[in-house]
Interface confidence: medium
């Protein structure tokens, strides 16, 4: 399955929107820094494309879930959020189309299941952090920056997959 060129553009637009969503300076939130333990190894280049697509799908689905909560709606600009949802939704569609075309329809390898679980646990840590910080502006800013990092890393993986074709 070939992810369309528009998928890469959509990823870049998503990152741009995340950047535009910034409301406050991270330097006013130094004490709120947190290491969420992004499972970087799960996004390594050792994956076959069949194993990668579901992990990327899980990543984007979790981002969508995180930013579509009531607390998120209160924290961010509504117009930017709507555009953000649209981009994420399109990317989910692209990845789902790949699965339907036959990539990853075989028995899920254990490695892939572990990777999806690692991504879910990562987002659980983010959700717990926000809850503990009572969804403060600084907490959301730290999370926004973290999602930019993790999304950027997963985007790099997508690009490396395209270049291997």
């Amino acid at each position: 399955c070939d992810l369309p060129q528009t998928h890469s553009l959509g990823s870049r637009r998503t990152l741009m929107l995340l950047a535009q969503m910034r409301k406050i300076s991270l330097f006013s939130c130094l004490k709120d820094r947190h290491d969420f333990g992004f499972p970087q190894e799960e996004f390594g280049n050792q994956f076959q494309k069949a194993e990668t697509i579901p992990v990327l799908h899980e990543m984007i689905q979790q981002i969508f879930n995180l930013f579509s909560t009531k607390d998120s709606s209160a924290a961010w600009d509504e117009t930017l959020l709507d555009k953000f949802y649209t981009e994420l939704y399109q990317q989910l569609n692209d990845l789902e189309a790949c699965v339907i075309q036959g990539v990853g329809v075989t028995e899920t390898p254990l490695m892939k299941e572990d990777s999806i679980l690692a991504v879910r646990k990562y987002f659980q840590r983010i959700t717990l952090y926000l809850k503990e910080k009572k969804y403060s502006p600084c907490a959301w800013e730290v999370v926004r920056a973290e999602i930019m990092r993790s999304f950027s890393l997963s985007t790099n993986l997508q690009e490396s997959l395209r270049s291997k074709e």
Epitope: R22, F27, L30, R33, H34, V142, A145, E146, S152
Partner: antibody, heavy 124, light 107 residues
């Protein structure tokens, strides 16, 4: 590769003000915070404050509060540091320095790109 | 403000020597600690951030360790270009503060 290019050396009289510029060439600075650090002759490094250009956030060290003003001009990718009521002990090399990452916010608050420095001499 | 105390303030060493510089914070700063190298007339250069992460392009003979209040910069085998002044810096909270510096000189 982004470079920070600072304005030239200045000689000022006590009581005067100085405005040092720091221009990002080869890239944009809007996502990055810029700190100002000074170094008196033969002395160590002293952080003066920070400006985050995209949200116009500034934070100054208490020691310079009321005397320092950091501003930015996004159209020219330039940040400025103005120090007023100069005294002889303000004689130093003034550096602008960019924070290491624009978006990653873990432990990585560090200055990876520095300007060449601007010598400000305060003398009567 | 968080005080950063470096030791020694200067040291003499030979090429090939193993050099250790320590930095102590006046309160717990987790791993929000960076190391810089500065040569005369030049701007500082970032060596290590987050207490132990080597900055891109910095030789692997440089390493950092520590957490909390006590930190160490180690140069495993001193090279001629390593003779310089080294500074630690905390970014746990503002104001960001530096150690007073350690000058590494040729013996």
């Amino acid at each position: 590769q982004v470079q920070l290019v600072q304005s030239g050396a200045e000689v000022k009289k006590p009581g005067a003000s100085v405005k040092v510029s720091c221009k990002a060439s080869g890239g944009t600075f809007s996502s990055y915070a810029i700190s100002w650090v000074r170094q008196a002759p033969g002395q160590g490094l002293e952080w003066m404050g920070i400006i985050d250009p995209s949200v116009t956030y500034t934070r100054y060290a208490q020691k310079f509060q009321g005397r320092v003003t950091m501003t930015r001009d996004t159209s020219t990718s330039t940040v400025y540091m103005e120090l007023s009521s100069l005294r002889s002990e303000d004689t130093a090399v003034y550096y602008c320095a960019r924070s290491l990452f624009p978006t990653i916010f873990g432990v990585e608050v560090a200055f990876d790109i520095w300007g060449q420095g601007t010598l400000v001499t305060v003398s009567s | 403000d968080i005080q950063m105390t470096q030791s020694p303030s200067s040291l003499s060493a030979s090429v090939g020597d193993r050099v250790t510089i320590t930095c102590q914070a006046s309160q717990d700063i987790s791993n929000y600690l960076n190391w810089y190298q500065q040569k005369p007339g030049k701007a500082p250069k970032l060596l290590i951030y987050g207490a132990s992460t080597l900055q891109s392009g910095v030789p692997s003979r440089f390493s950092g360790s520590g957490s909390g209040t006590d930190f160490t910069l180690t140069i495993s085998s001193l090279q001629p270009e390593d003779f310089a002044t080294y500074y630690c810096q905390q970014t746990y909270s503002t104001p960001i503060t530096f150690g007073q510096g350690t000058k590494v000189e040729i013996k």
